[in-house]
């Protein structure tokens, strides 16, 4: 069963290589456990960046070595991706799955184009 997922079209990473965006889903039922996955599409390749499953009222926890962090509020997930470099510029797609209670629903956003500009190295000062 399909579900609508909204996310911003474009986000610019800051000078420290951190980008944040909101992923919002239109829950057709009373979701109490949700799985959020961030996918990166570059060329025709799609790779998983990070994923987290959370219960409503519980914090959103990614794996310890994940480059993602996030918080949830109602039907919104605030996602932050860290450690980005210019080569990581690409389309980042938010996938949301309503895992429990049944029935299962899944929705995929149109993607957020994240632009990352590597900072210029500071010139040596004598």
């Amino acid at each position: 069963k399909a579900m609508h997922v909204a996310q911003p079209a474009v986000v610019l990473a800051n000078s420290r290589g951190t980008a944040s965006f909101v992923c919002e889903y239109a829950s057709p039922g009373k979701a109490t456990e949700v799985r959020v996955t961030v996918l990166r599409q570059a060329d025709s390749q799609v790779t998983e960046v990070c994923a987290a499953t959370y219960m409503m009222g519980n914090e959103l926890t990614f794996l310890d070595d994940s480059i993602c962090t996030g918080t949830s509020s109602g039907n919104q997930v605030n996602l932050t991706i860290q450690g980005l470099r210019a080569m990581d510029t690409g389309l980042y797609i938010c996938k949301v799955e309503l895992m429990y209670p049944p029935p299962y629903y899944m929705g995929i956003g149109n993607g957020t184009q994240i632009y990352v500009i590597d900072p210029e190295p500071c010139p040596d000062s004598d």
Epitope: K1, K30, T32, N58, M99, Y100, P101, P102, Y104
Partner: antibody
Framework: QVQLVQSGAEVKKPGASVKVSCKAS????????INWVKQAPGQGLEWIGD????????NSNQKFEGKATLTVDKSISTAYMELRRLRSDDTAVYYC?????????????WGQGTLVTVSS | DIVMTQSPLSLPVTPGEPASISCRSS???????????LYWYLQKPGQSPQLLIY???NLASGVPDRFSSSGSGTDFTLKISRVEAEDVGVYYC?????????FGGGTKLEIK
């Protein structure tokens, strides 16, 4: 090890209420939903509902709406089910069970059951 | 509600022999995500139910590999390759494709 320990057997009169408890140990209480299941004498299993220990949110079988109220006390890792306006057909063993996401939300640990007898 | 129907009601088996229990659902439990939301539980005499199988064919931790389960979207079979005395009890199939979660009526396996 994971354990769900339920309160003892109860004998109640018709029209009364009863509150059954389910104390969890051996895991992080707020990481798993708790379900409640009814088993009438010599009968099969009937799902009553579930509760999210984080925020007390519930899902329930319409058949038990107005009959069963599910609550939790996070501070003591305990789930409760209160049955109101008891009738003879509420006589049953009531189980609490933990849901496990790795098993696609199957009930992987069950309490020992609480027998509620309704008799005048 | 999804109705789960089991057969037979009672199954006498000789130890060492195979056994087979059927379960039928009133609606397909195969979701478009590829998951079949079918479970098997065993309730041994005087005990609480225990999980045997999840997602139609996966054995829960600690369940002996003499148990197996297969099926289509609506018809499922639990098989025990060689029945042992400790396998006696009532076997229940269940679904969680939709709320309310529902169980079959149970099949009582007994030793001949």
């Amino acid at each position: 090890q994971v354990q769900l320990v339920q309160s003892g057997a109860e004998v109640k009169k018709p029209g009364a209420s009863v509150k059954v408890s389910c104390k969890a140990s051996g895991y992080k209480f707020t990481d798993h939903f708790i379900n409640w299941v009814k088993q009438a004498p010599g009968q099969g299993l009937e799902w009553i509902g579930d509760i999210n220990p984080n925020n007390g949110g519930t899902n329930s079988n319409q058949k038990f709406e107005g009959k069963a109220t599910l609550t939790v006390d996070k501070s003591i890792s305990t789930a409760y089910m209160e049955l109101r306006r008891l009738r003879s057909d509420d006589t049953a063993v009531y189980y609490c069970a933990r849901l496990r996401r790795e098993y696609f939300y199957a009930m992987d640990y069950w309490g020992q059951g609480t027998l509620v007898t309704v008799s005048s | 509600d999804i109705v789960m129907t089991q057969s037979p009601l009672s199954l006498p088996v000789t130890p060492g022999e195979p056994a087979s229990i059927s379960c039928r659902s009133s609606k397909s439990l195969l979701h478009s995500n590829g998951i079949t939301y079918l479970y098997w539980y065993l309730q041994k005499p005087g005990q609480s139910p225990q999980l045997l199988i999840y997602q139609m064919s996966n054995l829960a931790s600690g369940v002996p590999d003499r148990f197996s389960s297969s099926g289509s979207g609506t018809d499922f079979t639990l098989k025990i390759s060689r029945v042992e005395a400790e396998d006696v009890g009532v076997y229940y199939c269940a679904q969680n494709l939709e709320l309310p979660l529902t169980f079959g009526g149970g099949t009582k396996l007994e030793i001949k």
